[in-house]
Structures are given as C-alpha cells and as structure tokens.
Amino acid sequence: QGWQAFKNDATEIIPELGEYPEPPPELENNKTMNRAENGGRPPHHPFETKDVSEYSCRELHFTRYVTDGPCRSAKPVTELVCSGQCGPARLLPNAIGRGKWWRPSGPDFRCIPDRYRAQRVQLLCPGGEAPRARKVRLVASCKCKRLTRFHNQSELKDFGTEAARPQKGRKPRPRARSAKANQAELENAY
C-alpha cells in the first residue's frame, strides 16, 4: 500500500516531571513514603534528566489517503504513528517499573503500537474502473512496552506485551506517594 500524508498533529503520553504514580496499597511502607520510586528525590541534584519532552511516547496523528496501485481512497484516513522515548526510568510509572530502578541499566521500553483498528475504505480508480473496497489496519494507540529479543529499534510493529519480571523474588520498594490526579492518566498511558 502506498500512503500520502497531508496533515499531522501529536498527542503525548507522558507523566509530569517530578510527579509519581501512587504505589499499589499492598506495597506501601511508611519508611519510604517520602522518596521517589526510582532512585532519588524528584530531580534537584547535579544529574538532572533532560527536558521532559525528550522522554515521551508520542502519538502522532497522520491523515493520509490509502492507495492501491492507481486507485486512491475517496476519503483520507487518520492513523497514529508512535514516536519518542520511554525513558529514563525516572519518568516511568510503577506499572512498567517492576524491576530494580536503582541499577545502572534495566528493562528497555519502547514507544510502539498498542492497539489497532480495522477500517473499511473505498478506493476510487481511474479509467472508469469500479470502486474497490479495502479493509486497512490502522494504529489506534501507542504504549511503552518492554523490548524483547524479537523487537528491533528500527522496526516498530505490533509487539506483544511483556512485563518486567521481578528480580530475585523481591517486591519492588515504593519510594514515593504522588499526586493522585495523575494516576488514572498514567495507568491508561502505560
């Protein structure tokens, strides 16, 4: 299929810098409630993260015509292209941070398609040919998902979800209670 884009805009899926999702109730521990989940208080020390926009999983909305040989869709379709970074861990919510965030290296998450939707389009062909009907699969949403050996940085297709396995059987330690207002948004985003 050929694609012709003529418009795009973007939606960012991102928690706000310095705000952390509330830990699950069973993990709460008063001793550590005043600390950030992933390895430090909200950034204020010499090694601050870069601008928050550099670490976002963005849903870019592209409006395109579907083509099939000489035929082109009567109306454009809108789909998403997933773009951006899913790190560093400081900006990732608990939902995907089940590993040990204090380690210098850890689970690699990528911004990739999460859900697809099917859309039927009518293709108009030149030379008086009868219109054709085609069903196309379009990206409906993006998500940060853990990279596995089947995934490739340059090949962002429909990858299966894989949770980060807990290390050595230890529960993750909650390190901060965050603004509840952000929680629902984060759970949906990631």
Epitope: T32, R35, N38, G39, G40, R41, H44, H45, P46, F47, T49, Q85, G87, P88, A89, R90, L92, G97, K100, W101, W102, R103, P104, S105, G106, P107, D108, R146, L147, T148, R149, Q153, R165, Q167, K168, R170, R173
Partner: antibody
C-alpha cells in the same frame, strides 16, 4: 563539586581480608545508588557489586559472591566493601561509582584505590 | 572473556567519523538499556551515553549511541585528538544478574 574518594587499598596476602571505603561529598548522598567497579592491571572494567539508596537491596558479581560484602552508611556519606578470602585475581584498581537516575548509567566515579593480592 | 563483545581497537583521523560496536545477547542488550563509558589514559571512567542514546549534560553531541536487537554502537563524529581513549559498553544481564561490561575498545586518533 561532586566527589567520591576511595581508601583502604593496599598489599594483602591471599586468603586475608581488606575493607575499602568511599567517602562522598558535593551531592545528596542518599539520592545515589552506589557500586564498586574494578579494573585489573591492563584489563577492562568489571562490575563488582551495587547497593540501593537505603542499603537494603544489593547485587554481586558471581566472581565475588560469598566473599565480598557491600554496605553504606548514609549518615556518614560513606560506602564500604568488605573483602574476605582474597585471591590473586582480585588484584585491581577499585572504583567507587554512583548513579542518580534509574537505569541511567554510572554518572559519578571516584579515582580508585589499588588492591594487590600477592604472597 | 567479556559477556559483551567489542573490537579491541579502532582508529581514525581528526574530523573523521568512527563507530565502535558492542555485541551481546538476548539476556543483556536484547532486553536492557545500554550505557557507554569513556576512559582517558590514567583517569577514571566517565559516563558518555546512557539509556542507549542519551547524553549526560556536558557530553558533546559528536557522541551518539544506538541499539538494534542484541547489538549497540557508539558513533563519534568530527574525531578529535582528545577522543583518544578506551571506550566500554555496559548493560544489565538478566541471567547473570550482574552489570556486564564489554572488553573495551582502544581508540587511536591518527
């Protein structure tokens, strides 16, 4: 200025013990997970052990498991490595290093202290 | 022998672009983030790249990192004489439950 200063290295016989210390200054100590990384003469880097902010979660390289113990004292801004049953192959320059970002690499390093294990 | 494999040496002339590779497996680079360190002669290592392709503040944008599958690479463009150093890649290994380094690559600026 962010600084990590190692001490406690020296010449020791195989089978003996040594305790390394790392004193931190210039940053909020308990914002950092801390690690020991060593480098044998003329060789590459080898991660030895790491400890989280509060000192209750620890990892070790297989080569030192059961012999070395990492610990930290946040009140004293200090990191320690207790090395028991030392072997000739433990001879190296031992670096103290820290990371402030989750999964963000070791972003602060000391200059190292030399441990020589020889009979 | 190192868990992550790097070429022992690399070289280039000033202004050139050089790339250093780092090969691993599904239990380290294939699943976890990659970091790169620079060690100038007689000094402690310095973090150059973290999380595959992020530069800490103060690191020139001549240095860039990338990762694909179970391999990673460090690219240095506009090579300068002060870039002459040893370069190490590193990643967490889920099987070993250790932070593993590559054997290091000695970069010579001709």
């Amino acid at each position: 200025e962010v600084q990590l200063v190692e001490s406690g290295g020296g010449l020791v016989q195989p089978g003996r013990s040594l305790r390394l210390s790392c004193a931190a200054s210039g940053f909020t100590f308990d914002d950092y997970a801390l690690h020991w990384v060593r480098q044998a003469p003329g060789k590459g880097l080898e991660w030895v052990s790491g400890i989280n902010w509060e000192g209750d979660d620890i990892d070790y390289a297989d080569s030192v498991k059961g012999r070395f113990t990492i610990s930290r004292d946040n009140a004293k801004n200090s990191l320690y490595l207790q090395m028991n049953s030392l072997r000739v192959e433990d001879t190296a320059l031992y670096y103290c290093a820290g990371n402030s970002r989750g999964y963000g690499g070791l972003d602060v390093w000391g200059q190292g202290t030399t441990v020589t294990v020889s009979s | 022998q190192s868990v992550l494999t790097q070429p022992p040496s690399a070289s280039g002339t000033p202004g050139q672009r050089v790339t250093i590779s780092c090969s691993g497996s599904s239990s380290n680079i294939g699943r976890n983030t990659v970091n790169w360190y620079q060690q100038l002669p007689g000094t402690a290592p310095k973090l150059l790249i973290y999380s595959n392709n992020q530069r800490p503040s103060g690191v020139p944008d001549r240095f860039s990192g990338s990762k694909s599958g179970t391999s990673a690479s460090l690219a240095i463009s506009g090579l300068q004489s002060e870039d002459e150093a040893d370069y190490y890649c590193a990643a967490w290994d889920d099987n070993l439950e250790s932070y593993v380094f590559g054997g290091g690559t000695k970069l010579t600026v001709l």
